[in-house]
């Protein structure tokens, strides 16, 4: 707390300007009117205040707006935003995308802080859903943002927003998240032709079911190994050797290098060795000739 002291004669601030950098903490507290500060917040960012001075300015705003700052002030917080706690931010009602962008700009190049996470949460909740413009903005600042959301939160992403997603935005997503995003992507890109569709849907395929992979195998898509390795194991297992060969096209040779890794390893164990041999890659571990293959899932359903 800064002590309440009278402002020295001639020091009363008539505007927020550079001369205030020379004020001591108690002088800022005594000589800067909170209402003046609120109306001239846009100037604060252009002035080299120290953190100590910014603390005083924040204190003045807190006193003026105990229930939370209005958006007109929030939009111009600039580096003062870094002084806000998540508790402060929870009091805000941020509805403008411009305000969100202005504050994200302040944190640009840094990890997502608790303040930023709280701000985004407030903003998205206020909007009711993660619309395309918001998603565009958030992934531009934080490519990993989408993968930080829970499957439940992702369910509020409308398919139209999927157009804003870039492949790198999905790098850290786990299968549960891709399970939610894939059907939305499929819906979003459904009117595209074969090759264009594959380019767009490729990064979401970690959530694709077997039947969709079978369908893709009929379209000469030439899936690369990196994409194949991210597919759901349970979706890959039912694929035949012929289907995998068609799915991968010229990239099928890459299976040899990955034969000890999932999902390739598990897929090999489900294939007849004869069929694997037709690939000419020397893949080993398939079911020997003459052995009966039981589909356990069918058996379980019958019993």
């Amino acid at each position: 707390e800064v002590e309440k002291t009278a402002c020295p004669s001639g020091k009363k601030a008539r505007e927020i300007d550079e001369s205030l950098i020379f004020y001591k903490k108690w002088e800022l507290e005594a000589c800067v009117d909170a209402a003046l500060l609120a109306t001239q917040m846009d100037r604060v960012n252009a002035i080299p205040f120290t953190y100590e001075q910014l603390d005083v300015l924040k204190h003045k705003l807190d006193e003026l707006y105990p229930q939370g700052y209005p958006e007109s002030v929030i939009q111009h917080l600039g580096y003062l935003f870094l002084k806000m706690s998540p508790e402060d931010i929870r009091k805000w009602n941020v509805t403008s995308l411009e305000t969100l962008k202005a504050l994200l700009e302040v944190n640009k190049g840094h990890e997502m802080s608790p303040q930023v996470a709280t701000l985004i949460d407030r903003f998205v909740k206020g909007r009711g859903q993660l619309d395309k413009d918001t998603l565009d903005t958030l992934t531009a600042f934080y490519p990993g943002y989408l993968c930080s959301l829970s499957p439940e939160e992702l369910s509020s992403v409308p398919p139209s927003s999927i157009w804003a997603v870039r492949p790198q935005d999905l790098d850290t997503c786990d299968p549960r998240q891709l399970d939610v995003l894939y059907p939305k992507a499929r819906l979003a890109f459904q009117n595209m032709n074969g090759s264009e569709y594959f380019v767009k849907i490729q990064s979401f395929l970690g959530g694709a079911p077997t039947e969709d992979l079978k369908a893709l195998s009929q379209q000469n898509v030439s899936m690369d190994l990196a994409t194949f390795m991210k597919l759901r194991t349970d979706a890959v297992l039912p694929l035949t050797v012929a289907e995998v060969q068609k799915l991968l096209g010229p990239h099928v040779e890459g299976l040899k290098a990955e034969e000890r890794h999932r999902p390739v390893r598990d897929w090999i164990l489900r294939q007849r060795q004869d069929d694997l041999d037709t690939l000419g890659l020397g893949l080993q571990g398939g079911i020997p000739n003459g052995y009966l293959v039981l589909d356990l899932s069918v058996q379980e359903a019958l019993s």
């Epitope: 001369s19 020379f22 080299p48 120290t50 580096y79 840094h110």
Partner: antibody, heavy 119, light 110 residues
């Protein structure tokens, strides 16, 4: 054109004080802050403090607090930097530099004043 | 205390490209503009880059600045013998107020 002209070299004994001047021309003296920066032989630049020529307000680097005094005389458009209790480590070239508002850059520099502290 | 870290020296042959890095923190580079100064032997520093990447008039476009997060860098392309000098990054620090990097000596080989 903007020019900052500093006083000549000084040789001082340890414990003494030195006062360096910086005369500004080519712009309104009270319109821009003046900073003082020093550079010991073979070393980097070190910010000492800043003065607002308009009101005379100052802000000093913590390291020099209590030993440095920055003043100005608006009638002759001159800023001064006085450093007291000199020691051998204060041997350096002392520069005045104008600070450009809004961008906070040192856009014009004096030619430097060498202060040698030696017994 | 130097809170902006620069390499003590860099070198390059004429015509080459060299970069000088400047590493800081959120209280300086991370929250303010960076400027760069060139100090030729025996002279006062001269402003080279301001506002992270802007060149004052008269500074050749061989000099360029960039910033990302809490680091900044100065790039010099088409190195010339007259570029041999000390280079300082600068910004103001929201803890100590103003700050310079330790400086980098650029040597032009040959």
């Amino acid at each position: 054109q903007v020019e900052l002209v500093q006083s000549g070299a000084e040789v001082k004994k340890p414990g003494a004080s030195v006062k360096v001047s910086c005369k500004a021309s080519g712009y309104t003296f009270t319109g821009n802050y003046i900073n003082w920066v020093r550079q010991a032989p073979g070393q980097g630049l070190e910010w000492m403090g800043i003065i607002n020529p308009h009101g005379g307000d100052t802000k000093y680097a913590q390291k020099f607090q209590g030993r440095v005094t920055m003043t100005r005389d608006t009638s002759i458009s001159t800023a001064y930097m006085e450093l007291s209790s000199l020691r051998s480590e204060d041997t350096a070239v002392y520069y005045c530099a104008r600070w450009h508002h809004g961008t906070w850059i040192f856009d014009y520099w004096g030619q430097g004043t060498l202060v040698t502290v030696s017994s | 205390d130097i809170v902006l870290t620069q390499p003590p020296s860099v070198s390059g042959a004429p015509g080459q490209r060299v970069t000088i890095s400047c590493s800081g923190s959120s209280s300086n580079i991370g929250s303010n503009y960076v400027s760069w100064y060139q100090q030729l032997p025996g002279t006062a520093p001269k402003l080279l880059i301001y506002n992270d990447n802007q060149r004052p008039s008269g500074v050749p476009d061989r000099f360029s600045g960039s910033k990302s997060g809490t680091s900044a860098s100065l790039a010099i392309t088409g190195l010339q013998s007259e570029d041999e000098a000390d280079y300082y990054c600068s910004t103001y620090d929201r803890r100590t107020f103003s700050v310079f990097g330790g400086g980098t000596k650029l040597t032009v080989l040959g």
